[in-house]
């Protein structure tokens, strides 16, 4: 069995201010067991935009139906874009552990570039 | 508060068919996957067939696969399970359960008794 | 399929342990549900592997590791006597399994 791989195929995207996101993700395996989190930054500093397990993340909506069984796409779109949303986003696959999982493997992740809205 | 409510069960003649249903309530009921598990009297629990959130994905385990029928309407809360050719092998409570992020169970109805018999 | 004990028993304030084996840890996740009398509704008391729900008091918790998972009821309780099933999700399978239940006496 392949181990599993995170894809993101953009290695950019730009969206106007106003407008929403879409950041593609996808798995090529749903073994080993765990959740798929989203952040912007890499490092101890990096935030938390989307957490498959729990949390509300008003702004942020998944592409596919993530309560599929064999979903493996973990897509999401962000909302009412401002250029504070500008950074690079990492979709990052965590597998199970106790008490805290464990970060298996990350995207190579998207830069989301904010244009300014039309006028 | 979360609710789930079975209903429909009753006593049926082996061959015939029932539609077992779950009205739901307290949380968002479209946003969840659900599923239906029984147990048989003196025996412990079998799960039976799972359903995505919007409803396009279903999944049955292979005893039930062809003969049971899970669904659901987002609109009335609702999750249903259309049984066919019952047995007296089906004899049992059906439990309808909120799936987690993971599809395991975190809330369960009452149960609703289904007795097949002649 | 999932192995687990038929019975367990103990005296109020100890800490009972039951297992459940059969699973593989890369592509399961477990739960334990709480059946108080045949027939009655279960009561999620761990999923997840560790995660309580909210309502469920601090003295249940879990762990999973290697092929096995285990329910720990510190200071145990006399309403804590009930059949305990472990469940597990395989996510090479899609399919839920159960353990044939243990049930807890507590003396």
């Known amino acids: 069995e392949d181990e599993l791989q995170v894809i993101q195929p953009e290695k950019s995207v730009s969206v106007a201010a106003g407008e929403s996101a879409t950041l593609r993700c996808a798995m090529t395996s749903l073994i080993p067991v765990g959740p798929i989190m989203w952040f912007r930054g890499a490092g101890a500093g990096r935030e938390l935009i989307y957490n498959q397990k729990e949390g509300h993340f008003p702004r942020v909506t998944t592409v596919s139906e993530l309560t599929k069984r064999n979903n493996l796409d973990f897509s999401i779109s962000i909302s009412n874009i401002t250029p504070a949303d500008a950074g690079t986003y990492y979709c990052v696959k965590f597998r199970k552990g106790s008490p805290d999982d464990v970060e298996f493997k990350s995207g190579a992740g998207t830069e989301l570039s904010v244009r300014a809205k039309p006028s | 508060d979360v609710q789930l409510v079975e209903s429909g069960g009753g006593v049926v003649r082996p061959g015939e068919s029932l539609r077992l249903s779950c009205a739901a309530s307290?949380?968002?009921?479209?946003?969840?996957?659900m599923s239906w598990v029984r147990q048989a009297p003196g025996k412990g629990l079998e799960w039976l067939a799972g359903?995505?959130?919007?409803?396009?994905?279903?999944y049955y385990i292979d005893s039930v696969k062809g003969r049971f029928t899970i669904s659901r309407d987002n609109s009335k809360s609702s999750l249903y399970l259309r049984m066919n050719s019952l047995t007296a092998e089906d004899t049992a409570v059906y439990y309808c359960?909120?799936?987690?992020?993971?599809?395991?169970?975190?809330?369960w109805g009452l149960g609703t008794l289904v007795t097949v018999s002649s | 399929a999932l192995t687990q004990p038929a019975s367990v028993s103990a005296n109020p304030g100890e800490t009972v342990k039951i297992t459940c084996s059969g699973g593989d840890y890369y592509s399961t996740y477990y739960a334990w549900y709480q059946q108080k009398s045949p027939g009655s509704a279960p009561v999620t008391v761990i999923?997840?592997?560790?995660e309580r729900p909210s309502d469920i008091p601090s003295r249940f918790s879990g762990s999973a590791s290697g092929s096995a998972a285990t329910l720990i009821i510190t200071g145990v309780r006399v309403e804590d006597e009930a059949v305990y099933f472990c469940g597990g999700y395989d996510g090479r399978t899609y399919i839920n399994t159960f353990g044939a239940g243990t049930t807890l006496t507590v003396l």
């Open positions: 999923h997840s592997d560790d």
């Open positions: 359903i995505s959130a919007g409803g396009s994905d279903t």
């Open positions: 359960a909120r799936e987690t992020w993971n599809h395991l169970f975190d809330y």
């Open positions: 307290g949380f968002t009921f479209s946003s969840h996957a």
